[in-house]
Interface confidence: medium
């Protein structure tokens, strides 16, 4: 059903929109899985909401949500994996709205870590490093990562390279002489999983050397 | 009311190829992994394959990996399996049958009757 | 992966007796098992999954217990139409596969 109503005091709620998203982080503690959903309006009354999961789950039918502030969570190592759970949105013991989801396809990884940047002088290039903790997985291990950098000053100017390992290289020609730039990285499943890209891993800084004159080349 | 059925099964040479081809009706097919089970005559049950609802879960027996292909078509609500270089010890009745993961886990809760492979020369 | 060792292996009982079938995983598997009844000439039918749960229209009569490594499926009070072949069967879902165990014969004394 898609409204509820009882005793005038919920007469309006057939005319909110309950439709809500979800992502899924496997493995997030340990061998803890995690489910986080939160209503697309963010000016839905939660009051008396409740959101519940049902179907796809180790030794028990159904589970309910924590609720944190403006979403909805849960924690537990009961997620099957394999085919679609129902998810639905509740008051009381009547579904406001359900959707039918596989957590395997709303998959959003960790954000990367320990993003670094080393220049190599004899190179004559920059070696772009960090970490993920997918490595140590048993589930979500592929990742496709998106690095982003660019130039302090170009706001919105960011230049973008996709690739499967942890290590890129960037060749000191295609960037711009003594400019400090900003880089960051994220993920995405890639291979078996599906889903949405990570939070985005915190920035770091580096400046590019100034340009030898005689040489014209960065110093 | 739910229903599988089977067919594609006869007699075939060793080394030949047979494709078995199984029928759902009566339930939202593409909410559900499927499987295929075999059983020798006179035999136990043998798990030969199985596929997940979206057809990126795939799984085989070692005893038929690299020979035999799952996969299945949404749209027209049906499972097949694709077995190539057959072998005397493929002789089996060939059951597809249906997942019910709201179980709780992979729980077979659906078979069709079978269809009957015979590899001999 | 996972196998599963059944026990008996053939077993003879009378109308009216009580009748535990044991199996037996090579690692723990928590409640992850279910027991089907087989017929001759037919095909299997699910009787209990999640170790302990009983499907829809199966008899009171059966039951299973168990977690980890050792399981049972009891019946009992048996009926002339309990005599059969009896499946447990495990699963992992990642990556895919299920086993079965060997079977237990059930025949009539």
């Known amino acids: 059903e898609s409204g509820y109503a009882q005793n005038g005091d919920l007469e309006d709620a057939e005319l909110d929109d309950y439709s809500f998203s979800c992502y899924s982080q496997l493995e997030v503690n340990g061998s803890q899985h995690s489910l986080t959903c939160a209503f697309e309006d963010p000016d839905v009354n939660t009051t008396n909401l409740e959101f519940e999961i049902c179907g796809a789950l180790v030794e028990v039918k159904c589970l309910n949500f924590r609720k944190l502030q403006e979403i909805y969570f849960i924690e537990t190592k009961k997620f099957l994996l394999i085919g679609k759970s129902n998810i639905c949105v509740k008051v009381g013991e009547k579904s406001l709205t359900c959707k039918k989801i596989d957590l395997t396809t709303i998959v959003k990884p960790e954000a990367p870590f320990d993003l670094s940047v080393i220049y190599r002088e004899g190179a004559n290039d920059f070696v772009v490093t960090f970490n993920t903790s997918h490595l140590q997985k048993k589930y979500v291990k592929v990742l496709m990562h998106d690095v982003a950098y660019r130039q302090e000053k170009d706001e919105n100017k960011w230049t973008h390279v996709n690739l499967s390992s942890t290590k890129l290289t960037l060749l000191q020609r295609k960037l711009q002489p003594a400019a400090m730039y900003e880089i960051k990285v994220r993920s995405i499943p890639d291979h078996y999983f599906k889903g949405f890209w990570s939070e985005w891993s915190p920035s770091y800084y580096f400046r590019t050397p100034e340009i030898n004159n005689s040489s014209g080349e960065m110093d | 009311e739910v229903q599988l059925v089977e067919s594609g099964g006869g007699l075939v040479q060793p080394g030949r190829s047979l494709r078995l081809s199984c029928a759902a009706s009566?339930?939202?097919?593409?909410?559900?992994?499927m499987h295929w089970v075999r059983q020798a005559p006179g035999k136990g049950l043998e798990w030969v394959s199985g596929?997940?609802?979206?057809?990126?879960?795939?799984g085989y027996a070692d005893s038929v990996k690299g020979r035999f292909t799952i996969f299945r078509d949404n749209a027209k609500n049906s499972l097949y399996l694709q077995m190539n270089s057959l072998r005397a010890e493929d002789t089996a009745l060939y059951y597809c049958?249906?997942?019910?993961?709201?179980?709780?886990?992979?729980?077979?809760?659906?078979w069709g009757q079978g269809t009957t492979v015979t590899v001999s020369s | 992966a996972i196998q599963l060792t059944q026990s008996p292996s053939s077993l003879s009982a009378s109308v009216g007796d009580r009748v535990t079938i044991t199996c037996r995983a090579s690692?723990?598997?928590?409640?992850?098992l279910a027991w089907y009844q087989q017929k001759p000439g037919k095909a299997p039918k699910l009787l209990i999954y999640?170790?302990?749960s009983l499907e829809s229209g199966v008899p009171s009569r059966f039951s299973g217990s168990g977690s980890g490594t050792d399981f049972t499926l009891t019946i009992s009070s048996l009926q002339p139409e309990d005599f059969a072949t009896y499946y447990c069967?495990?699963?992992?879902?990642?990556?895919?596969?299920?086993?079965f165990g060997q079977g237990t014969r059930l025949e009539i004394k």
């Open positions: 596929i997940s609802w979206n057809s990126r879960g795939i």
């Open positions: 999640d170790a302990s």
């Open positions: 009566g339930f939202t097919f593409d909410d559900h992994a």
């Open positions: 069967q495990a699963f992992n879902s990642y990556p895919l596969w299920i086993t």
């Open positions: 049958a249906k997942d019910e993961y709201s179980r709780g886990y992979y729980v077979l809760d659906v």
């Open positions: 690692q723990g598997i928590s409640s992850a």
